[in-house]
Structure formats: C-alpha cells, structure tokens
C-alpha cells in the first residue's frame, strides 16, 4: 500500500558520464606527496583494523545501459592508499546567540561525538572503496529509479544550509535497490574541495575525486525520516562522483548556473524542476554497496550506501564554480565539506559486478578475495 | 515521534506584543527546521517564519521587521516574538518541525490562537 506523500516543504522555502581516458597511476596522491590521512580535528579517532586514509512494488523500468569508454572506478591502478594531505577547513555557523553542541563543524570543535554519540560508531561513513577487496554479489541487479524526470514546475528549493547546497525532492522519486527494497528520494547535496583540491568524501584505493553526490532516500518502510534513523536500511543514500571532463555537463549547469543567488549561508532559492536522473551516472548495474552511516551528525547508522562505478563528468569551470561560490559563516568560504574516511572494521563491501577479479595477464587465475553475503536473497 | 505544543497566544490590541512558544519532546531537536505558520478563518495555511537547525532564519514579507523567530536547543523550544501586531494577524498559529535530512514537513503542533482587535 502507498504511505501518504508529505506535501509540504519545510517552512524555509521561499546522462552525465564521461568519456574520459581512465585514470592513470599519475593521477593518484604519491607516497612522498600525501601523508597518512588523519581525521579532522572535529572528529575523534574510531578504532579498528581497517584505518585506511584517505524501498508499494515499483513497476519494471529499464535500467540505463553502460556507456562506451567511461571511466570505471574498477581501472583504477591498485596502489598503496596513502590517502592525501588535506583537512577539510573550519566552516560550521556560528549562530547569533551563541555555540551550541548541535552547531558541528568540519575540522574543529566540538567532536562530532559531542554532537552525537552516534559519530563514534562501529559503522561509520565514508569509507575507503578497495575494488579488489570487494565481494562479487550476482543478486545485487541494476538499480530501477522511477519518477525522477521532473516537470520544470513545482520548482524545487536549493539551499545553501551553511555545510552543503541541498536540493529537496518532491514526493513521488521512487527507487529500488532490489526486489522489496523500495525507497523514495528526499534530497540530494554535493560534496566538494576547493582548487587544486579534491573533496570527495569516499575514495578508491586511497584516490580522492574532485567532488560527490548524494541523493538521500528514505525507505517505504517508514513515513518519517526520524523513525528511519539508525534502522538497518532505513535510509539509504545513492553516491556517485564527480569528475572533470573536457565538455560542460548540462544537467549540473541547472543547479550550478543558480549558485550565486545563494552564496549567502543560510541563503535559499527556487529552481524549475529538472532530470534528477541525469545528475546520476548512467550505469545502473556497475555499482559498491555496504552498510555505513549519514556522514555529518547525527551520524546514524543502518544507512545503505551505493557507491557508483562510472563517474560523472563536469567541466574545469564547473567543478571550480562548484568549490569556489559559496560561503559558509564568517567570511570563510564553503570548501573541503567532507568527513574523513572511517574504518570498515570487518564490514566487507560488496560489488554487482566482479570488480575484485584481476584480469590481469599476470593472474592465471581470476582471484576473488571475498565471498558475497547474498544480500537480498 | 516528536510532539510540539504551542502557547503564548491570546488577545491582544493593535501596536502590542506577543511572545509564542512551542516547546519539543520525543525527538532529537537540534536536527529538526523549526517553522511558524498561521491560518486565519476562510484563508489558506501560510508562512510566517522559519528557522534551521543551524540559526538560518527567514520571513514572511508581511512580517519581516515585526516578528523575529528563534530558537533555544538545551529548552528544546523555538519563539516567535510578535511586535507592532494588526489586526491582519489574527490567526492560529502553529508550529511545525522538519528533520534536517528530509526537507518536509514532518510534525505539526494543534496551534495557538492570537487575536488582534482593540
């Protein structure tokens, strides 16, 4: 049966892939170049063995097919992951009246367990993404998205919120991560560095990409995000990153052309509605999966993570728009708004496809480190 | 599940002061937008003030210099101080709380009546 849809906003409103070579070993951070990645000041130490750096059916929809020639996370030279040299600066607003505990930051007081316990989980995200550590999961099918081309009206609010630009959806984005699996998309946000400084908040293999998106969703199971929280597979998050590419990718124009209206934190406008879908890569099959947490307080836990294999692609000038408009509080610019990546701690990640096999003429075997733990079955 | 309950409304002449309240329980409130809305009789649900988990606060038009919104995290409380009051604010007020994550509309209180008439 169909919850009812939440038909207001709250009261504060007034194919993207490229074409790219894959990444050679020059674009990795080098040993000499990038130190251990340590955790921003914000944020407690977690330990673990892995401290590695840097959801009513939804009708059948053809999920996107692969596009030739771009870049799969999977080509990824396997190095060393030094992780890399960058904190993510102090950005967090101040308010008026006075800190409080709930005014967290990126890299400074109060520690994020202050905030919320939650951060100094087990389970935490963002983590490192090692492809050959993966699990090869043949029952994790291509992800089905259903209503997620929008009509130019309503529009949408884009915010600056003082630690992201944030996108909320309308109700009706449905998607399925797998038979009973069904969600519906709340709100998407970027993640980003600052010049010459990727901000990614996952990595691969220690590579840190110039940004990421995050379209949250909350499970059919519940009708509030509240009741979600902390429940396995309550919510769940699509990832992807994002890349530069030679050509202007249009469908991030539509948000990014809109950036200097709310350079202002705490600033809002209104967006006409557009393809969420296109803001996505278009492989829906290739995809890393593993169980995580929201990554700024709360910090809640059960968070189903789904990290794309091909990239997105964005121009130098839109990735540079991207990092360079925005203002957080006291004159400090909004930049490096991304967690540190957090240990596994025996979680194993899981992948649709065989991202773990090295086909490599070296191997005379394909080599699969991990089984996969059937999730969905 | 978050509960919210208004009070402070009731009568007041025309130029006066009003001080709402709307107190929070069941649920985490430094991670939920806080919002004020009213309804006057024959006319649709608007607007009045909305302030985030952060302290970003924004207006109605038709209110902007009058009211000022804020909120106190350690009360689990939001304010909505109502200064210079007309007669064209008669209404229910009612507050509202959205989870950060979400961006809707997730609790509504059952509202405070404020009266304007000399």
């Known amino acids: 049966q169909r919850l009812p849809r939440m038909q207001e906003d709250s009261p504060l409103g007034g194919g993207s892939s490229g074409e790219d070579d894959p990444l050679g070993e020059e674009d990795l951070p080098s040993e000499e170049d990038s130190p251990r990645e340590e955790d921003p000041p914000g944020e407690e130490d977690l330990p673990g063995e892995e401290d590695l750096p840097g959801e009513e059916d939804l009708p059948e929809v053809k999920p996107k097919s692969e596009e030739e020639g771009s870049l799969k996370l999977e080509d990824l030279p396997t190095v060393e992951a030094p992780g890399d040299p960058q904190e993510p600066q102090n950005n967090a607003h101040r308010d008026k009246e006075g800190d409080d505990q709930s005014h967290w930051r990126y890299g400074g007081d109060p520690p994020w367990p202050r905030v919320s316990p939650a951060c100094a989980g087990r389970f935490q995200s963002p983590v490192d993404i090692r492809p050959q550590l993966a699990a090869f999961c043949p029952a994790l099918r291509p992800l089905e998205l259903l209503g997620f081309q929008l009509p130019p009206l309503p529009e949408l609010r884009l915010r600056n919120n003082g630690h992201s630009v944030q996108l909320t959806l309308p109700p009706g984005l449905e998607m399925a991560l797998g038979p009973g699996r069904e969600y519906r998309a709340l709100q998407l946000h970027l993640h980003w560095g600052a010049a010459g400084r990727p901000g990614s908040e996952h990595t691969v293999e220690g590579h840190r990409f110039p940004a990421e998106i995050h379209v949250v969703h909350l499970s059919t199971a519940f009708a509030r995000v509240d009741e979600a929280l902390g429940r396995p597979g309550g919510l769940a998050v699509l990832a992807a990153f994002l890349e530069e590419g030679p050509e202007e990718n249009s469908a991030y124009e539509q948000l990014l052309s809109r950036l200097e209206e709310i350079a202002e934190e705490g600033s809002e406008t209104q967006v006409p509605g557009l393809d969420i879908s296109a803001l996505l890569p278009s492989d829906f099959s290739r995809y890393f999966q593993y169980e995580g947490s929201l990554t700024t307080p709360p910090c809640a836990q059960g968070v189903i993570w789904t990290v794309f294999n091909q990239t997105v692609m964005l121009s130098a000038k839109q990735l540079h728009t991207l990092s360079d408009t925005l203002w957080g509080p006291g004159d400090s610019r909004l930049q490096l708004n991304f967690r540190a990546t957090q240990p596994l701690n025996g979680r194993v990640i899981e992948a649709s496809f065989p991202a773990g096999v090295d086909s490599s003429p070296r191997a005379a075997e394909p080599v699969q480190l991990n089984s996969c733990l059937a999730a969905g079955d | 599940q978050v509960q919210l309950q208004e009070s402070g409304g009731g009568l007041v002449q025309p130029g006066g002061s009003l001080r709402l309240s709307c107190a929070a329980s069941?649920?985490?409130?430094?991670?939920?937008?806080m919002g004020w809305y009213r309804q006057a009789p024959g006319k649709q649900r608007e607007l009045v003030a909305g302030?985030?988990?952060?302290?970003?606060?924004n207006y109605a038009d038709v209110v902007k210099g009058r009211f000022t919104i804020s909120r106190d995290n350690a009360k689990n409380t939001v304010y909505l101080e109502m200064n210079s009051l007309k007669p064209e604010d008669t209404a229910v007020y009612s507050c509202?709380?959205?989870?950060?994550?979400?961006?809707?509309?997730?609790?509504w209180g059952q509202g405070t009546q404020v009266t304007v008439s000399s």
């Open positions: 302030i985030t988990t952060r302290g970003y606060t």
């Open positions: 069941g649920g985490d409130f430094r991670f939920y937008d």
């Open positions: 509202s709380a959205s989870h950060f994550l979400g961006g809707r509309i997730d609790y």
